[in-house]
């Protein structure tokens, strides 16, 4: 159908709750596109009625809420006037229990966000909340350890928690939980987020951290177009390289005629404390000699690698 | 649609205190935080603090943190602002202020002003 | 508390031509969740403030589209693509990244 393939890392998710992911990728869609979601490679797009508990809106898919059975591969086709892209996005749901007395015990949140905190800092948690204007949110409420936060070293802030005066005690396990409209029926949303304290002002050293990749497998097809990022994070005054590896070359170097494979341009986002650096790899066309080779993103003295993997063949 | 009305026009001897209104109607009226803000005469806008209506919790910038009080009336949807100790400089307008909505922040609604001047 | 900056004081702009405010805070306010908590206002002479632009670059409700917001963490600019008579006002930018919020002092657009 000549779209082509781009292979976005998988989204895990919790039972019976709205989500939403928003299909777009700023080189393609900052154009005149249509966009047109479908699931599991069927021919028949994701509807468009808004009453439909699984509907597109606008370039948007809306899970309300979201079931134990939609897990799965779903794909967003982009089409521009002389471009087709498709985007495979692999949902995992989960059952989630909280702080169901039934159950016993706090809920185990290290699957979910991980936020941090600087002691002895005024900082703030973020609840992280990606629905389309259809969709009206609040209040939002935070929890502590299965309690309501209250105090003067508290305030909630739109989707944020300020924390005046961060101490050790306020490591732990919160959930953000807000309220979301849409069509006149209510859902509740809830976002655990696992808290940890640094006393280091940003981030210390000068070692970098690779965020992504995490020395993985990423199942593609033969003869798609991939893109990768290798996020890292790092000081603001570091001095060190960020770059893609392959058999300890350059991945420019090693595809030095054909091109195929390549390093995109570096680009990073300044925060208070620390940069954000974005690098990736773009593998034009997949091919077999591309699997089980493992690609890597260096950073400074970090490393973390990609290994491309077949898909297993479906049989059903 | 969102409505803030506000208390008339207040004239005050140095010293004394003025308490200004703020009426809300046409949302949830303790889902919001309320911000006052003033405006000294041909001056910029300052931030006084905040008022969580449902818990009445006030956030205050600092400045202001010995005279002022916050309290609302949730059966008429009203807060409240008393500022006490007033001397010449806190001539100004008093604006309060609701968010966009609950999850962006900026004020997009506001009320439309009360004129307080101390003057002996 | 985080000072916002503001230039220039006042600017003078023929109706039709491109208009540029810009605002500069004292400390970062992209937040590590990808937002950057920085506003724009219009004070219209005798009335209160209007939300022009919020997080940094959306379009308030009802806001035309000749305004336009950027920036980086720390410098911000709005941008009036035409000028019209209505848009005359002193132009404030804020910041509500943390506790006390504050504003810039302002800058007066008038209309050659």
């Known amino acids: 159908d000549g779209c082509k393939d781009i292979f976005m890392k998988n989204e895990i998710l919790s039972a019976s709750q709205p989500f939403a992911f928003n299909c777009t990728f700023p080189p393609i869609t900052s154009g005149e596109v249509s966009v047109t979601w479908y699931k599991n490679s069927s021919k028949i797009p994701v509807s468009k009625i808004i009453q439909s508990r699984i509907h597109q809106d606008e370039t948007w898919i809306l899970f309300l809420p979201m079931e134990w059975g939609d897990s799965g591969v779903y794909q967003c086709v982009i089409k521009g006037r002389d471009s087709c892209h498709r985007i495979h996005v692999n949902l995992t749901v989960f059952e989630k229990h909280w702080c169901d007395t039934s159950i016993g015990g706090l809920p185990n949140l290290s699957d979910e966000y991980k936020q941090i905190l600087h002691l002895g800092k005024d900082d703030s948690l973020t609840c992280h909340l990606h629905f389309p204007k259809s969709c009206v949110l609040g209040p939002i409420k935070w929890y502590k350890d299965c309690n309501e936060i209250k105090g003067e070293r508290f305030t909630v802030l739109e989707t944020r928690l300020l924390v005046s005066n961060v101490s050790a005690e306020d490591r732990g396990n919160y959930a953000c939980q807000a309220i979301l409209t849409h069509s006149g029926k209510q859902y509740e949303v809830l976002n655990g987020i696992t808290v940890s304290i640094t006393e280091r002002a940003g981030y210390g050293g000068s070692v970098p951290k690779i965020i992504y990749p995490k020395n993985h497998s990423i199942e593609v097809q033969l003869g798609t177009t991939l893109i990768v990022d290798c996020n890292v994070t790092d000081t603001k005054d570091n001095t060190n390289l960020r770059c893609w590896r392959v058999n300890n070359t350059l991945v420019d170097d090693y595809y030095d005629e054909s091109k195929r494979i390549r390093e995109g341009v570096e680009t990073h986002v300044s925060f208070r404390e620390h940069n954000l650096y974005t690098v990736n790899i773009t593998f034009l066309e997949v091919k077999m000699e591309d699997y089980g080779l493992p690609f890597m993103c260096h950073a400074g003295v970090s490393t973390a690698y990609i290994i491309l993997q077949l898909p297993a063949p479906d049989f059903r | 649609q969102v409505q803030l009305v506000q208390s008339g026009a207040e004239v005050k001897k140095p010293g004394a205190s003025v308490k200004v209104s703020c009426k809300a109607s046409?949302?949830?009226?303790?889902?919001?935080?309320m911000n006052w803000v003033r405006q000294a005469p041909r001056q910029g806008l300052e931030w006084m603090g905040m008022f969580e209506p449902s818990n009445a919790v006030t956030r205050l910038n600092q400045k202001f943190k010995d005279r002022v009080t916050m309290t609302r009336d949730t059966s008429t949807s009203t807060v409240y602002m008393e500022l006490s100790s007033l001397r010449s400089e806190d001539t100004a307008v008093y604006y309060c202020?609701?968010?966009?909505?609950?999850?962006?922040?900026?004020?997009?609604?506001w009320g439309q002003g009360t004129l307080v001047t101390v003057s002996s | 508390d985080i000072v916002m900056t503001q230039t220039p004081l006042s600017l003078s702009v023929t109706p039709g031509q491109p208009a540029s405010i810009s605002c500069r805070s004292s400390k970062s306010l992209l937040h590590s969740n990808a937002i950057t908590y920085f506003y724009w206002y219009l004070q219209k002479p005798g009335q209160p403030p209007q939300l022009l632009i919020y997080q940094m670059s959306n379009l308030a409700s009802g806001v035309p589209d000749r305004f336009s917001g950027s920036g980086s963490g720390t410098d911000f600019t709005l941008k009036i693509s035409r000028v019209e008579a209505e848009d005359v006002g002193v132009y404030y930018c804020?910041?509500?990244?943390?506790?006390?919020?504050?504003f810039g002092g302002g800058t007066k657009v008038e209309i050659k």
């Open positions: 046409g949302y949830t009226f303790t889902n919001y935080w």
């Open positions: 804020a910041q509500n990244l943390e506790l006390p919020l504050t």
């Open positions: 202020a609701r968010t966009t909505s609950m999850i962006i922040g900026g004020f997009a609604y």
